[in-house]
């Protein structure tokens, strides 16, 4: 029976050009975690395997860094990185647990402030 729960960073925002850490945590289960997948829609970004460690998909190698922990760091963010990200915990005997994070990438704060505030 699947008793575990996944806590995530939920809805987050970050500045264009910056970086962000995606974090998930599986709790309330004694199941063994054999692998954690990080996915964006149906694209595999990275894998953290209990035996092999980290594998970053070749197309994301330049902008994705493993960790901290089972988390994932996205770098050099662009507006196109806005969207849903999923952490998928493969466990035994429970099976698959999925957490969802929504990331919004904003224009830089300088641009924002310039648009919103007038200097007296």
């Amino acid at each position: 029976m699947m008793t575990g729960t996944i806590e995530t960073t939920g809805n987050i925002s970050a500045e264009k050009g910056g970086s962000i850490i995606l974090q998930c945590h599986l709790s309330s289960t004694t199941a063994q975690v054999t692998q954690v997948n990080w996915e964006q829609q149906d694209q595999l970004l990275a894998i953290c395997n209990a035996d092999l460690g980290w594998h970053i998909s070749p197309s994301f190698k330049d902008r994705v860094a493993p960790g901290p922990g089972l988390g994932l760091t996205l770098q050099s963010l662009t507006v196109n990185d806005t969207g849903e990200y999923f952490c998928i915990y493969h466990t035994y005997p429970d099976g698959t647990y999925t957490g969802r994070i929504f990331l919004e990438v904003l224009e830089s704060s300088v641009a924002e402030h310039g648009a919103r505030f007038q200097i007296p």
């Epitope: 997948n37 149906d42 595999l44 894998i47 395997n49 035996d51 092999l52 493969h90 099976g95 698959t96």
Partner: antibody, heavy 119, light 107 residues
Framework: EVQVVESGGGLVKPGGTLKLSCAAS????????MSWVRQSPEQRLEWVAE????????FYSDTVTGRFTISRDNAQNTLYLEMNSLRSEDTAMYYC????????????WGQGTSVTVSS | DVQITQSPSYLAASPGETITINCRAS??????LAWYQEKPGKTNKLLIY???RLQSGIPSKFSGSGYGTDFTLTISSLEPEDFAMYYC?????????FGGGTKVEIK
């Protein structure tokens, strides 16, 4: 070309033992988790056991726990299934299969090796 | 264990037709269902996983849909090589379990 080839099946008496082998080629064996799946004479498929890429995690269906042991030799690119205390209900075609890198399914299967448990 | 009920168990169709095969899980398996093709003398072939993801090298005439408990495999424009046995399998929780299979034969 990815290939997995099973061997070691045969006729065995109830209570007997058998060791199946699966020789893998065409891919980096040590990177992939592997599974054994069996197909009964009635054509029903049943997942039997799984082993992680490095061999540190092994998982079994309740029907074989305590009787079957899955293992692997990454240096020899070979997967094993040691079957003890065999029962008539273990009669089946046994398939070795590779688990996808993302852990979602079984992407390459062998032709199978037949195991018959009968007195 | 999650029980998988596959229907129909037998299906007769003509080349060029579009067919659907259904699988129902005894409880929610999220999107985690795979479809395989079995042919005599050939090794089993993974077609679809995670409900709708097409396995690399599989033609787009095969498509999967569904979520929760109800899933469908659609094969469009049937060709002679598509007449085979098809199985679904849940990969949401252990033990992974399979449907009973659907035999697709030429009408």
């Amino acid at each position: 070309e990815v290939q997995v080839v099973e061997s070691g099946g045969g006729l065995v008496k109830p209570g007997g033992t058998l060791k199946l082998s699966c020789a893998a080629s065409g891919f980096t064996f040590s990177t992939y988790a592997m599974s054994w799946v069996r197909q009964s004479p009635e054509q029903r498929l049943e997942w039997v056991a799984e082993i992680s890429s490095g061999g540190s995690h092994t998982f079994y269906s309740d029907t074989v726990t305590g009787r079957f042991t899955i293992s692997r030799d990454n240096a020899q690119n070979t997967l094993y299934l040691e079957m003890n205390s065999l029962r008539s209900e273990d009669t089946a075609m046994y398939y070795c299969a590779r688990k996808t890198l993302d852990y979602y399914a079984l992407d390459y299967w062998g032709q199978g090796t037949s195991v018959t448990v009968s007195s | 264990d999650v029980q998988i009920t596959q229907s129909p168990s037998y299906l007769a169709a003509s080349p060029g037709e579009t067919i659907t095969i259904n699988c129902r899980a005894s409880k929610s398996i999220s999107k985690y269902l795979a479809w395989y093709q079995e042919k005599p003398g050939k090794t089993n072939k993974l077609l679809i996983y995670s409900g709708s993801r097409l396995q690399s090298g599989i033609p787009s005439k095969f498509s999967g849909s569904g979520y929760g408990t109800d899933f469908t495999l659609t094969i469009s424009s049937l060709e002679p090589e598509d007449f085979a046995m098809y199985y679904c399998q849940q990969h949401n929780e252990y033990p992974w379990t399979f449907g009973g299979g659907t035999k697709v034969e030429i009408k």
